[in-house]
């Protein structure tokens, strides 16, 4: 699987999950989240050659098409597969609230 | 929705479904499919700016990150959303077989 265990410990050139730290204020302009100040969101990057963790029959077809037509702009793209939530603290007035923001952290990628 | 109805009738620059005809022999090297000789597979293409048909909370975060960090390689990608099957005819010996190949045709796209 193209997950953090494999990708973070390898020098994989193809589609894989990469490390990305996002600071809520600096990178998003969000001031409403009190904690954490930022988080390891990660992101997906890398080419999707034929047979590389292809998502659907269509992805396989498109990767093969791309192999036969190298100059084509039609190619599968490396995108998130497994996403995890992020717990945050924000304030309503003076009262702190804890909430889980769903689908915030990329754990693995796929070619779609 | 970024579907064929909208995308094929507009000059949309952002993520949208685009027309793509795939010839099984020429483009994939497949000789085993008897009919059809090819099909309109379509593909997804175009940038994914903030708020443009974003798939998950993560996609929104990443698009916003990209807006604040324009040079970054981390950005959402335009990928298939709705896929449809394709009926095909192939031969087992001299006997024709009809089968549905699932997830073969892109009907709409999303930013993931």
């Amino acid at each position: 699987a193209l997950d953090t265990n494999y990708c973070f410990s390898s020098t994989e050139k193809n589609c894989c999950v990469r490390q990305l730290y996002i600071d809520f204020r600096k990178d998003l302009g969000w001031k409403w989240i009190h904690e954490p100040k930022g988080y390891h969101a990660n992101f997906c990057l890398g080419p999707c050659p034929y047979i590389w963790s292809l998502d659907t029959q269509y992805s396989k077809v498109l990767a093969l098409y791309n192999q036969h037509n190298p100059g084509a702009s039609a190619a599968p793209c490396c995108v998130p597969q497994a996403l995890e939530p992020l717990p945050i603290v924000y304030y309503v007035g003076r009262k702190p609230k804890v909430e889980q923001l769903s689908n915030m952290i990329v754990r693995s990628c796929k070619c779609s | 929705a970024l579907d064929t109805n909208y995308c094929f009738s507009s000059t949309e620059k952002n993520c949208c479904v685009r027309q793509l005809y795939i010839d099984f022999r020429k483009d994939l090297g497949w000789k085993w499919i008897h009919e059809p000789k090819g099909y309109h597979a379509n593909f997804c293409l175009g940038p994914c700016p903030y708020i443009w048909s974003l798939d998950t909370q993560y996609s929104k975060v990443l698009a916003l990150y990209n807006q604040h960090n324009p040079g970054a390689s981390a950005a959402p990608c335009c990928v298939p959303q709705a896929l449809e099957p394709l009926p095909i005819v192939y031969y087992v010996g001299r006997k024709p077989k009809v089968e549905q190949l699932s997830n073969m045709i892109v009907r709409s796209c999303k930013c993931s």
Partner: antibody, heavy 117, light 102 residues
Framework: QVLLVQSGAEVRKPGASVKIFCKAS????????MNWLRQAPEQGLEWMGQ????????NYNGKFKGRLTLTADTSTNTAYMELSSLRSADTAMYYC??????????WGQGALVTVSS | DIVMTQTPLSLPVTPGEPASISCRAS??????LAWYLQKPGQSPRLLIY???NLADGVPSRFSGSGSGTDFTLRISSVEADDVGVYYC?????????FGQGT
């Protein structure tokens, strides 16, 4: 490399105020929270407050509310901590420390403040 | 305020032996915890952030584990240079309180 250089030792009488500085270099000063902490002699660490130099937003430990003021000068990449109405219990080593990724990753060398009559 | 409780308060260790320090939070802090080492006369030094991540330049004999309310700092093989006071600190809403130190 990241460097936080603090002002020297200060001696104050009870009731007075003290203002110490922390000059930052080697990173984007405006886009990282700066924490202030202290450590009384032979005691543990205590978090006092933090400031976001980019917009001046602050979070204070309620224990110091009304006595503690955090400011930042983005033209010189310098953070300031002012503590008023000093008492002998405020005698401590005062630290500035950069906030990063759920931690304070770089610390100043500390500034000793002694409150004595 | 969240209360951080460290155990033990004192830990004598022979060089080459493993050591572990526990830190308990009075409420769920998820993985928002850091560990520091303070040597005599020095500023604290970050060892572990986000409960399990080794800070830059920290030897691999140090490791952190846990999430929620219970956390552990482990030293696989203690060296003489590891002497000092170890602190845990939470980052789950201000004020960011520390353990008493070990």
């Amino acid at each position: 490399q990241v460097l936080l250089v603090q002002s020297g030792a200060e001696v104050r009488k009870p009731g007075a105020s003290v203002k110490i500085f922390c000059k930052a270099s080697g990173y984007s000063f405006t886009s990282s929270w700066m924490n202030w902490l202290r450590q009384a002699p032979e005691q543990g660490l205590e978090w006092m407050g933090q400031i976001y130099p980019g917009d001046g937003d602050t979070n204070y430990n309620g224990k110091f509310k009304g006595r503690l003021t955090l400011t930042a000068d983005t033209s010189t990449n310098t953070a300031y901590m002012e503590l008023s109405s000093l008492r002998s219990a405020d005698t401590a080593m005062y630290y500035c420390a950069r906030h990063y990724d759920g931690s304070t990753d770089y610390w100043g060398q500390g500034a000793l403040v002694t409150v004595s009559s | 305020d969240i209360v951080m409780t460290q155990t033990p308060l004192s830990l004598p260790v022979t060089p080459g032996e493993p050591a572990s320090i526990s830190c308990r939070a009075s409420e769920n802090i998820y993985s928002n915890l850091a560990w520091y080492l303070q040597k005599p006369g020095q500023s604290p030094r970050l060892l572990i952030y986000a409960a399990t991540n080794l800070a830059d330049g920290v030897p691999s004999r140090f490791s952190g584990s846990g999430s929620g309310t219970d956390f552990t700092l482990r030293i696989s093989s203690v060296e003489a240079d590891d002497v000092g006071v170890y602190y845990c600190q939470h980052f789950w809403g201000t004020p960011y309180t520390f353990g008493q130190g070990t």
